[in-house]
Amino acid sequence: SPTPFGPEGQLADELHKPKAIQTEVKPSVRFNLRTSKDPEHEGCYLSLGHSQPLEDCGFNMTAKTFFIIHGWTMSGIFENWLHKLVSALHTREKDANVVVVDWLPLAHQLYTDAVNNTRVVGHSIARMLDWLQEKDDFSLGNVHLIGYSLGAHVAGYAGNFVKGTVGRITGLDPAGPMFEGADIHKRLSPDDADFVDVLHTYTRSFGLSIGIQMPVGHIDIYPNGGDFQPGCGLNDVLGSMAYGTITEVVKCEHERAVHLFVDSLVNQDKPSFAFQCTDSNRFKKGICLSCRKNRCNSIGYNAKKMRNKRNSKMYLKTRAGMPFRVYHYQMKIHVFSYKNMGEIEPTFYVTLYGTNADSQTLPLEIVERIEQNATNTFLVYTEEDLGDLLKIQLTWEGASQSWYNLWKELRSYLSQPHNPGRELNIRRIRVKSGETQRKLTFCAEDPENTSISPGRELWFRKCRDGWRMKNETSPTVELP
């Protein structure tokens, strides 16, 4: 098939590039029990059917057991995300068994061959789990399989083949090519464990989608819409590297799922929350910040078990680095009237002032056209905890939607040089915090002066007639 255009082209070439791998036989999968956070430490290899290594390596039968499953590799050595994940698991769950599933011989192949090997690797993990189940005190319910990329589908096979039901599978940006749209028994699916949660960070609706786009778990979380991750843009990557490449951008976005999971382990006090929504566009409009009826959840390790009958797609925004948590706000702005607007589409900017901190000036992303005499909903997010909101500063600019509109505006201005000023009339802003679920209404500071021209400021303070709009049932998630 032809190589897709765009940034993924290079990686697509890599997927199909022949690779001479000197391997005489295909040895079995290895299970490396990581007994230390230390990257120098060699760990301990478990052997199916041999109980002595379990004792020698200090395998704790009653503790949680994590199996980390890597994906396709071009290098034949474990990348450092694996070390970070091992270290984070040891930090968070001190008594847990952390096992790295080494299937490098079967993953250091052409991508297509590695895909064809996922089933046999899943079977090997299932056999190991079946053997462990024969031991006293070992419970499959305490097993958590964590698979990255191709490893997520390996985890799916393992969960499918094992006798009984694995406690949890976390899919970290499960691989897309050759799995998108596949039958549930040939990819990760909700049937593979008691709880299957998935983070999608590199999905593309055009070109090659390295990560799978479709929901494959009980909850499927799409940070930043599941596509363009902050801090992974070409400028960010090139800016931090002597010689950056598109491949680095791909790696940054694909691997972001792992770092979000690591963040959830080590920054327990700064949990990120995701909100159920039917699609990314609706989330960007700010209409999905509800925690009612299990509509919100922590992401990563702290996710609460939700066994939905259907897949639940959830969204959130994040920072560019750890800690990834941001604070989401829904803003409802009722635009009462336009004055002399012509073809110009307004772009709003808000600055939020709180008891703890003030935000930067934040643009309100326009997903759909601003409606006159209607309530327009927006999503804004801040990197810092502002505390209780006290006031809001609003400005707007006339952003032309096209060169044609810009020309029309210029022509209109030249024909009527004394064109009266363009104005919007905004009397109040309603705000809902995603993290606290608190609702507030902000009224114009001067009720007699609610018209605003481009570049001018309008100030809003908490309305005197009570700020709590209406009671909402308390969140089902333990919110901070």
Partner: antibody, heavy 120, light 107 residues
């Protein structure tokens, strides 16, 4: 104790090939990767590539492209590095070094080095 | 490739001195920095790995610190056997790269 013992010095003509061996002992050969690092006279250290003895998978520094071939024989716990189409600037001491399972694992044990001289 | 730059390239010091060698990476290497000591005609020896962890058998006068792109190796009190060349190496990204070395000589 962990030991890596390399083959003796070699003198080669330009265009020829050289094969250096590295015999491991004191640990399970397939549990660590073997890397090759060279050092030209009076110069610094340069990573050439590695082999995963567990299954023979390799990864080379792009600089050496198709000139370097790494193999291993698990029955005698020995890794090999062959450098072909030798040039005078390949004159260097070639070291094998053991490394753990991650990128970040350090080169914790080194061979004594093999001097390769390329001269017409 | 990630460039590793050591400074100084050489320095003279006396027994008992406190010595600091710095290493700068061309990008963030997530603390995956290792230090080696090499004496003339010998293979390098691992001193410190993962920025600050001391390899077994290495005297405690050697210590490492730093984060992001800037790292240091410190010898708290120089001993006669410490006069050698020191190299830093990043283990963050392939290809693995080394600094150009710092030669520590007797004053």
């Amino acid at each position: 104790q962990v030991q890596l013992v390399q083959s003796g010095a070699e003198v080669k003509k330009p265009g020829a090939s050289v094969k250096v061996s590295c015999k491991a002992s004191g640990y399970t050969f397939t549990d660590n990767t073997i890397h090759w690092v060279r050092q030209a006279p009076g110069q610094g250290l340069e990573w050439m590539g590695h082999i995963n003895p567990y299954y023979g998978g390799t990864n080379n520094n792009e600089k050496f492209k198709d000139r370097v071939t790494m193999t291993r024989d698990t029955s005698i716990s020995t890794a090999y590095m062959e450098l072909s189409r030798l040039r005078s600037d390949d004159t260097a001491v070639y070291y094998c070094a053991r490394k753990g399972i991650y990128y970040s694992s350090p080169f914790d044990y080194w061979g004594q080095g093999t001097t390769v001289t390329v001269s017409s | 490739d990630i460039q590793m730059t050591q400074s100084p390239s050489s320095l003279s010091a006396s027994v008992g001195d406190r010595v600091t060698i710095t290493c700068r990476a061309s990008q963030d290497i997530n603390n995956y920095l290792n230090w080696y000591q090499q004496k003339p005609g010998k293979a390098p020896k691992l001193l410190i790995y993962y920025t600050s962890k001391l390899h077994s058998g290495v005297p405690s006068r050697f210590s490492g610190s730093g984060s992001g792109t800037d790292f240091t190796l410190t010898i708290s009190s120089l001993q006669p056997e410490d006069f050698a060349t020191y190299y830093c190496q990043q283990g963050n990204t392939l290809p693995f790269t080394f600094g150009q070395g710092t030669k520590l000589e007797i004053k």
